[in-house]
Structure formats: structure tokens, C-alpha cells
Interface confidence: low
């Protein structure tokens, strides 16, 4: 049998502490009681806790735990959120600069192409931005569309300026001829390779960062089980029931309880480690043609070279296209 | 080769960025992020210990609470959890992770597989033209100056001139992060309940 409480024992200290949790005092016994209805803080002797107090302690313990978890992840969460925003904006800046570089190249070297070239370049880089942000656009199609659009303008403005401005009928034929005759040589394929490699790595990098945020958010807002709530209550609050207000949990005991409460969360560890190491590997490989900054900022130069290639072969091309698109041109001149 | 179109920018910020030599590049920012992330590589396995060290536990006291009674800090009883008749800690562990945790583990598995695939020199990724041959040969110099393109006029070197942090608004250091003290920051009385 547990010893009875001393005759002068009261629950005054317990009451004043509990008042901070729950303003209503009616749940705290005046003097220690047997506590036979308790389910968590099983008494070894008289207790200053009631069933209602136990329930309140459990709720508070779980809230404490959630708050501790959020506090623990705050720095990591901020690091990833901040960097995801930085890189997303940085990549958009690169795209904007690349577009400016390309437009400037047209303006300096091919002023006669500028109005239309600016439009096609703008559409291409809009697609690049959308692709990085996750749109299901095919990079090859983007590049093909750029060169398909550019070639009729190059043909009518640079190679064959005698054609009427309203050469819409010939445009379709020229678009087809562009691919069939490989008028830009290997440059479209080169750009496809470089752009697809660099952009794919860029968007998987961004996706990985966004998933990192999702992982932290998920574990940040975990609701702990009732069993965990009971364990935490035992550790943090059951000592109060015996009037032990200043005593703290044993370190080893705390670790055991936390491992029990967080067994599910700790299962993420293996995949989290792998995530960081895999991300490191990806980042280490983001150079040369896997670095979108490098690739996109050099595109203006490659596009310039591709137009020079067309100009070098202009004589031969004009003859071939003249025959190939003759029907369209005749309709034009009528 | 193409005239370098540096002087055509109207955007003053762009001009500013193009000529700053010692700001961070995108690649250095990426590497810096990885280094910081690597310091969190044990984040999840260390969580139980972290939370114990940031909640009240007996450190210098002779006596501590083991869930049932007051015991000496170094006694065998101190490590016991005092839950024998109530619920089994082992059972709690055996329940496995919550569905949301399982889902996030699945997503991590997928992203890890993607990251590994992309990191391979011949990453077997399904997007078109990701591994076309013949465009990577030749020595292109260091990370800052890379070969782009190439034609009869020879390879063109393009200097990575953009220095991004000069332009970005996000220049907070992690140390400046709000509430970064690592301590539990009480929101109200309902939550702040530790009694010391």
C-alpha cells in the first residue's frame, strides 16, 4: 500500500502551475487524492492530478512537440525556401539576358531581320522559361520552331530581297525546305543538344529544391499519435502530479521517448541523406553544356554562326529553293 | 564572330551586373547551397537528440524524472522509461510511418532516382537528344570560360559575366533568418508550458 500523504499536504503549487495552462481551477484537487481513474500518470501514491488534467497535459505535450519540431527545422526550411526563390529568379534573369543578347546580335548584324526576329526570339525564350518552370514543352520543337520561323525571313530579307513583302505563300514552302535542305547545317541540332541538356538539369534542380521544401513542410506539420502524447505527458508533466515541480526528465529517458515518437520521421533519414548527396552530384555536373547560364548566354553567337552558314551557301540554296518553291513563287507574282 | 552585344542593354541593373567582377556566380551559389545543405545531412536522424537538448532535461541536477519516479541521474533506473504496463515503445516504433511520411519518402525516392539518372555521364533520361554524341569533344578550358557553339570561324568563348547577387533581392544570409535562434519560440500560453 502506498503511504498516505502528510496531513498538511496540499495541491497548491500544482494548482498555480496548472492555472497557466487552463484558467478554470475546478480540475485540480485541493489535496492529494488516490487518482484511481488516471490512465497516464499512474500514481505510486496520492496524486494532485485528475483525469481532466491528464487530458489537458496530453494536448499540451503534443503541441509542445510540434512547436519544438518546427523550431528545429526553421533554419533548414529557410535555407531551401530562400535558395529556391533565388535560383528561380536567377534562371529567369539568365533567360532575359540571353534574349537581350540574341536581340542585340540581330540588331547589330542583321537590322533588316529585327522586327520579325525579335518576335521569334521572344517566343523561343518564353518557351525556355516555361520549360524550366515545368511545362511539358519539347525542346526540339522549340528549336525547330525558331529556325523554321527565322528562315523565311532570312530568305526573303537577306538572300532574296527582291521578293514581295507579302510572301506568305512561299513561307510554308521555305519552312519545309529549311529542314529538308538542312539550310542551317548542324547548328539546330547542336542547339537542341545543348539547350535540352542544360534546361533539363536546370529544371530537375529546381524541382529538387521545391521537393526539399515539401519534405520539411510535411515533417514540420506532423500530428503526433495519442501514444506519443501519453509518453510525452509522462515525461514532461506526470512529475507535477507528485508535487515535483522543479524536477526535469532524465536525458536517456528523453532520448528513448523521442525515438519512439519520431520513429516514422526518422525513416526519412536514409532518403534525405541520399537526396543531399544526389543533389550535390547534380550540381557538380552543372557545367559546360549542362550549365544553362553558359549555354543560353552563348546562344546568340551560335545563332549568328548559323545565319553566316546560310549566307555562305546562299547561292546554291537560292537556286535549289527557287526550283523547290517555284510553284509558290509563281502564285505570288501573278 | 558575332559582335558582343553588351552595350545594348537598356536595363541599368543589367549593365551593373555585367561589370561587377567579384560577386557570386550562379555556380558558386549552387556550391554554397550544397555545402550548407550537407551540414543538415543528419537532420532527421539527429532530430530526437536535438529536441531533447532543446526541451527541459536534467543536465547538472543529481535527481531526474524517469516517468514514474525521482531517480539518481546516473542510476540504471534513469534510463528506464517507466511505461511497462501502459504501452509498448517497441509497438509504437513498429507501427511504421504515417501515410504522409510514406508519401514524402516515395517522392524522395523518385527525385533521388531522377537526380542520379541526370548526374550520370550518360544519364539514361527519356527526354529527346539528351545524349547526342559529338558535341562535347575538345578541351574547352575552365568553368568560367566555356565553349559554346562552333562553326567554320572556330569555337567562340563566352565569358560568364553575370554576377547574380548584385541583382537579386534575396541577399539575406541564413544567420539573418527570422527566429533563427533554434530555441522554441512560444506563441502563446497554450503552447509555452515548460516550467523551469
Amino acid at each position: 500500500q502506498p503511504p498516505p500523504p502528510p496531513p498538511d499536504a496540499t495541491c497548491h503549487q500544482v494548482r498555480s502551475f496548472f492555472q497557466r495552462l487552463q484558467p478554470g481551477l475546478k480540475w485540480v484537487p485541493e489535496t492529494p487524492v488516490p487518482g484511481s481513474d488516471l490512465q497516464v500518470c499512474l500514481p505510486k501514491g496520492p496524486t494532485c492530478c485528475s483525469r481532466k488534467m491528464e487530458e489537458k497535459y496530453q494536448l499540451t505535450a503534443r503541441l509542445n512537440m510540434e512547436q519544438l519540431l518546427q523550431s528545429a527545422s526553421m533554419e533548414l526550411k529557410f535555407l531551401i525556401i530562400q535558395n529556391a526563390a533565388v535560383f528561380q529568379e536567377a534562371f529567369e534573369i539568365v533567360v532575359r539576358h540571353a534574349k537581350n543578347y540574341t536581340n542585340a546580335m540581330f540588331k547589330n548584324n542583321y537590322p533588316s531581320l529585327t522586327p520579325q526576329a525579335f518576335e521569334f526570339v521572344g517566343e523561343f525564350f518564353t518557351d525556355v522559361s516555361l520549360y524550366i518552370l515545368g511545362s511539358d514543352i519539347n525542346v526540339d520543337d522549340m528549336v525547330n520552331e525558331l529556325f523554321d520561323s527565322l528562315f523565311p525571313v532570312i530568305y526573303t530579307q537577306l538572300m532574296n530581297p527582291g521578293l514581295p513583302d507579302s510572301a506568305l505563300d512561299i513561307n510554308e514552302c521555305l519552312r519545309g525546305a529549311r529542314r529538308d535542305l538542312k539550310v542551317f547545317g548542324n547548328f539546330p541540332k547542336l542547339i537542341m543538344t545543348q539547350v535540352s541538356k542544360s534546361l533539363q538539369v536546370t529544371r530537375i534542380f529546381l524541382q529538387a529544391l521545391n521537393l526539399g521544401i515539401e519534405v520539411i513542410n510535411t515533417t514540420d506539420h506532423l500530428k503526433f499519435s495519442k501514444d506519443c502524447g501519453r509518453m510525452l505527458t509522462r515525461m514532461w508533466y506526470c512529475s507535477y502530479c507528485q508535487g515535483l515541480m522543479m524536477v526535469k526528465p532524465c536525458g536517456g529517458y528523453c532520448n528513448v521517448v523521442m525515438q519512439g515518437c519520431m520513429a516514422g520521421v526518422v525513416e526519412i533519414d536514409k532518403y534525405w541523406r541520399e537526396y543531399i548527396l544526389s543533389l550535390e552530384e547534380l550540381v557538380n555536373g552543372m557545367y559546360r553544356i549542362y550549365d544553362m547560364e553558359n549555354v543560353l548566354l552563348g546562344l546568340f553567337s551560335t545563332i549568328h554562326d548559323s545565319i553566316q552558314y546560310v549566307q555562305k551557301n546562299a547561292g546554291k540554296l537560292t537556286t535549289t529553293i527557287g526550283k523547290l518553291c517555284a510553284h509558290s513563287q509563281q502564285r505570288q507574282y501573278r | 564572330s558575332a559582335y558582343y552585344p553588351e552595350d545594348l542593354f537598356i536595363d541599368k541593373k543589367v549593365l551593373k551586373v555585367a561589370h561587377v567582377e567579384h560577386e557570386e556566380t550562379l555556380s558558386s551559389r549552387r556550391r554554397e547551397l550544397i555545402q550548407k545543405l550537407k551540414s543538415f545531412i543528419s537532420f532527421y536522424s539527429a532530430l530526437p537528440g536535438y529536441i531533447c537538448s532543446h526541451s527541459p532535461v536534467a543536465e547538472n541536477d543529481t535527481l531526474c524524472w524517469n516517468g514514474q519516479e525521482l531517480v539518481e541521474r546516473y542510476s540504471q533506473k534513469a534510463a528506464r522509461n517507466g511505461m511497462k504496463n501502459q504501452f509498448n515503445l517497441h509497438e509504437l516504433k513498429m507501427k511504421g510511418p504515417e501515410p504522409v511520411v510514406s508519401q514524402i519518402i516515395d517522392k524522395l525516392k523518385h527525385i533521388n532516382q531522377l537526380l542520379r539518372t541526370m548526374s550520370m555521364p550518360k544519364g539514361r533520361v527519356l527526354d529527346k537528344n539528351l545524349d547526342e554524341e559529338g558535341f562535347e569533344s575538345g578541351d574547352c578550358g575552365d568553368d568560367e570560360d566555356e565553349c559554346i557553339g562552333g562553326s567554320g570561324d572556330g569555337m567562340i568563348k563566352v565569358k560568364n559575366q553575370l554576377r547574380f547577387l548584385a541583382e537579386l533581392a534575396y541577399d539575406l544570409d541564413v544567420d539573418d533568418a527570422p527566429g533563427n535562434s533554434q530555441q522554441a519560440t512560444p506563441k502563446d500560453n497554450e503552447i509555452s508550458t515548460f516550467h523551469n
Epitope: 524541382q207 | 525516392k109 532516382q113 539518372t117 544519364g123 539514361r124 527519356l126 529527346k128 539528351l130
Partner: antibody
Framework: EVQLVESGGGLVQPGGSLRLSCAAS????????MSWVRQAPGKGLEWVSA????????YYADSVKGRFTISRDNSKNTLYLQMNSLRAEDTAVYYC???????????????????WGQGTTVTVSS | QSVLTQPPSVSGAPGQRVTISCTGS?????VHWYQQLPGRAPKLLIY???NRPSGVPDRFSGSNSGTSASLAITGLQAEDEADYYC??????????FGGGTKLTVL
């Protein structure tokens, strides 16, 4: 209906060559990676080679490296396996298989082989 | 190249539950399972460790833990008698198959 039909198998002498074809229908061929898998008489499955959707990336098992060449013609929806310097141990039923396209968000990656042909038999014997 | 190891044979009576193990998947890639009925081409049974393509009965299920995976068949039926293969990718992303397991329905 998604379908793969192999052809080109037959009897060939050791050291000889053979070209297998696999005609695909019912799906957008260029969007999917393809593999060749073989099965020797009474034995298990052995992966031989794979090729990305664009044809840019090729993969070979060690046992066939340098002797077999995988290729595709996306305009004809056809996968090929050129087999040179054939050996007796290359005798098998050769299956072509479509790699499953598993999308995670907007990315693709390999996730098993979800469509198989009926197989074509290659016998290497003198 | 990596190796996936399966038991050569397993057997069970109709209605019973059988499992087939597959060990050695160290690359971290998921394991996929194929069924090959006698004289037929293989058929994808389970992908991504525990997903069933449409048309595959829910009697078939997969699980994965660390370097091993397993295929479980509950309510065994005579038509389940076949060869079963596990498949994954090695670190070079080459496909690898297990040696195959012959399932006999007693």
C-alpha cells in the same frame, strides 16, 4: 492497340551476322526508350541493349558490347538490332520491349518494360 | 554487372499464399516483376516495387526493403503456374534480370 512485332531471326553460322527488326504500333514511338531482351532455350531472361527515344543514348550488356548495335528509325516506328560476330551462346529468342514511361511531375524515367513482342528466334550453329 | 538472385522454384496449393524473393538490388532502383507463362512472352506484373498495371489481379503484390524485394501471390490459382522474373537497373542504368523462379501450383 499497342503492339510490337519482331522479325529477322533465323539460322546463322558462328561469326555470321543478322539484323533483327521490331515494328511498333499503337503508341508514339519516338517518345519511348526501347530494349532488346533475349532468352536462351530453357534459360532465364537476359537484357541485351537499350536505346533512348531520340536514339542518342545507347546501352549494352557486357556480353554483346562491340558486337551488337542497337538503332531506331522513328519515321518508320522501327527498332533494330544489328548482330555481328555471332556465337553459339547468342542462340535465343529475342524480344523487343518498350520501356515504361513513368512521369514524375514533368520528368520521365525508366520504370520497367510494359509492352513486349512475341519474340523472334535466332539460332547460331554450324 | 550486378546480379539479382531469386529462388529457382517455389510451389503452393490452390488458394495458398506464396512469396518469391529477389535479393541484390544495391543500386537503389525499384524492382519490377514479370510473369512468363509457358511458351509466351513475358508480361509486366508489378512495377515500381508495388504498382500493378491495369488488368493484373490484386492477388499479386510487391514489396521492397533495402537490397531485397519480394512478390506475393495470394489465393493461388492453377493459371498462376509460370516463370516469374524480377528486374532492376544497375548503377550504370543497364537493366538486370533475376534468374527467374518457376512457380508450381500443386
Amino acid at each position: 492497340e499497342v503492339q510490337l512485332v519482331e522479325s529477322g531471326g533465323g539460322l546463322v553460322q558462328p561469326g555470321g551476322s543478322l539484323r533483327l527488326s521490331c515494328a511498333a504500333s499503337g503508341f508514339t514511338f519516338k517518345d519511348y526508350a526501347m530494349s532488346w531482351v533475349r532468352q536462351a532455350p530453357g534459360k532465364g531472361l537476359e537484357w541485351v541493349s537499350a536505346l533512348s527515344g531520340s536514339g542518342g543514348a545507347t546501352y549494352y550488356a557486357d556480353s554483346v558490347k562491340g558486337r551488337f548495335t542497337i538503332s531506331r528509325d522513328n519515321s518508320k516506328n522501327t527498332l533494330y538490332l544489328q548482330m555481328n560476330s555471332l556465337r553459339a551462346e547468342d542462340t535465343a529468342v529475342y524480344y523487343c520491349a518498350k520501356e515504361m514511361d513513368f512521369r514524375y511531375g514533368w520528368m520521365h524515367y525508366y520504370y520497367g518494360m510494359d509492352v513486349w513482342g512475341q519474340g523472334t528466334t535466332v539460332t547460331v550453329s554450324s | 554487372q550486378s546480379v539479382l538472385t531469386q529462388p529457382p522454384s517455389v510451389s503452393g496449393a490452390p488458394g495458398q499464399r506464396v512469396t518469391i524473393s529477389c535479393t541484390g538490388s544495391s543500386s537503389g532502383y525499384d524492382v519490377h516483376w514479370y510473369q512468363q507463362l509457358p511458351g509466351r512472352a513475358p508480361k509486366l506484373l508489378i512495377y515500381g516495387s508495388n504498382n500493378r498495371p491495369s488488368g493484373v489481379p490484386d492477388r499479386f503484390s510487391g514489396s521492397n526493403s533495402g537490397t531485397s524485394a519480394s512478390l506475393a501471390i495470394t489465393g493461388l490459382q492453377a493459371e498462376d503456374e509460370a516463370d516469374y522474373y524480377c528486374q532492376s537497373y544497375d548503377s550504370s542504368l543497364n537493366a538486370i534480370f533475376g534468374g527467374g523462379t518457376k512457380l508450381t501450383v500443386l
